[in-house]
């Protein structure tokens, strides 16, 4: 759902043409057009992390970055390369929530993010290569899926304190990256405009050299940039106990087996708890709908069993410094 606009090439002024005011005033709209050429493509982000507490558990965070309203969210998991997957929970904004063992609690965190807790009986080894997928549907626009998994080397019983490190999720990094390029482009454009201040203004016209002029692509600052600073999230504390899947899941379980320890969920704390807390050295795998994957070590907040909605306690300053963890 990305819209594109063709940006006309800047041609040198034709001989004999003066840089009239009429021509000069055309420059500003085009500069502005390059800034807001496109609307952001909806994307889904997922973060998976294993908790290291008495019981075994995964923490997964999923969210939808897009303007459309969500009509359905499906959370699933399975083995590597799409092997032996099954649905864990389905969340419908109007018709309710369905979940299947070992899912313990599915919930909406915000209008564009969900939370799910999966817990088992506490085994010692992590689920190697387990993949978790979140699929967000926005009717009638379409649906988008992102998947995340723990690196096989993840150690739930890490005793050494993790090293804090600033993290940017893949989707936010993408937005900021494009914004940076845009900003640079704008500054450069303004620089060129100042250089040609006392010369005849260049005449704007579509390029005749190629049938398709270069296309400028960018996130609309008014929409995407704000979304980046108010990223909703969902936390899924999931424990890998697929043994319960075949017996309890009405749709039949996967053919693969693995085990993960789970932990007791804690209730969310106030903003102060986000201030300066360590982030695991070995992080989760973040995936974005377009297939970009980035390692992230952010530790998501623990969510309690309650169904009360709460916004991101960090507010609009969420991008400052390392993402907080308890």
């Amino acid at each position: 759902m990305r819209t594109e606009a063709q940006v006309p090439a800047l041609q040198p002024p034709e001989p004999g043409l003066e840089g009239a005011m009429g021509h000069r005033t055309l420059v500003l709209p085009w500069v502005l057009l390059t800034l807001c050429v496109t609307a952001g493509t909806p994307e889904v982000w997922v973060q998976v992390r294993m908790e290291a507490t008495e019981l075994s558990s995964f923490t997964i965070r999923c969210g939808f970055l897009g303007s459309g309203s969500i009509s359905l969210v499906t959370v699933s998991w399975g083995g590597p390369n799409g092997a032996g997957g099954t649905t864990l929970a389905v969340l419908h904004p109007e018709r309710g929530i369905r979940q299947w063992a070992p899912a313990r609690q599915a919930r909406w965190e915000t209008q564009s993010s969900i939370s799910l807790i999966l817990e088992g009986s506490g085994a010692s080894s992590p689920c190697a290569n387990t993949t978790f997928c979140c699929k967000f549907a926005s009717f009638p626009e379409g649906s988008w899926e992102a998947c995340g998994s723990l690196p096989p080397s993840s150690d739930p019983g890490l005793s050494a304190p993790p090293t804090p490190a600033p993290i940017l999720r893949a989707d936010l990094a993408g937005i900021l990256g494009v914004s940076g390029v845009l900003l640079f482009g704008c500054v450069y454009l303004l620089h060129l405009l100042r250089r040609h201040k006392h010369r005849p203004a260049p005449r704007l016209q579509p390029s005749r050299t190629s049938p398709q002029a270069p296309r400028a692509r960018a996130w609309a600052p008014s929409q995407a940039s704000q979304a980046a600073l108010h990223v909703p999230y969902a936390t899924i504390n999931t424990s890998c106990r697929p043994a319960t899947l075949d017996t309890a899941h009405p749709h039949g379980g996967p053919s693969w087996w693995a085990s993960l320890p789970t932990h007791a969920a804690h209730r969310p704390q106030g903003p102060a708890a986000w201030a300066s807390t360590p982030i695991p050295a070995r992080g989760s795998f973040v995936s974005v709908e377009n297939g970009l994957y980035a390692q992230a070590g952010e530790r998501p907040p623990h969510t309690g069993p309650g169904l009360t909605l709460f916004p991101d306690p960090r507010g609009p300053r969420a991008m400052e410094g390392p993402l907080g963890v308890r």
């Epitope: 359905l72 499906t74 799409g82 997957g85 419908h92 997928c133 549907a137 749709h251």
Partner: nanobody, 127 residues
């Protein structure tokens, strides 16, 4: 972006057969239950059949039991619906959808109740 593309529809005589296909892309097909739903002219959306993620369980609406067979090939990311002994009342637009409508009940079904949906393929049974 997730895409579901149905094919195989067409005009067939009563008692004839058709095989619908649904090619899926943009998501981990093998992790999800898939269904076929249909909408007859002037009618609401009706569930037809569902198959779970590993093809270990299938279910059908009573009116098609013994005539329709749902299947999937996870290696090809494709869902199928083999329709035999077709009747005039099977005339409808058939949609491939992700999800099981039984999750929230079959009443007042809408495409928005599913995680993904295709554009539909028309099946006309007429002599």
């Amino acid at each position: 972006e997730v895409q579901l593309v149905e094919s195989g529809g067409g005009l067939v005589q009563p008692g004839g057969s058709l095989r619908l296909s649904c090619a899926a892309s943009g998501f981990t097909f093998s992790y999800y239950d898939m269904s076929w739903v249909r909408q007859a002219p002037g009618k609401g959306l009706e569930w037809v059949s569902t198959i779970n993620s590993n093809a270990g369980r299938t279910s059908y609406v009573d009116s098609v039991k013994g005539r329709f067979t749902i299947s999937r090939d996870n290696s090809k990311n494709t869902l199928y619906l083999q329709m035999n002994s077709l009747r005039a009342e099977d005339t409808a637009v058939y949609y491939c959808v992700e999800g099981d409508p039984h999750n929230f009940g079959l009443e007042s079904l809408s495409l928005r109740d599913f995680g993904s949906w295709g554009q539909g393929t028309m099946v006309t049974v007429s002599s």
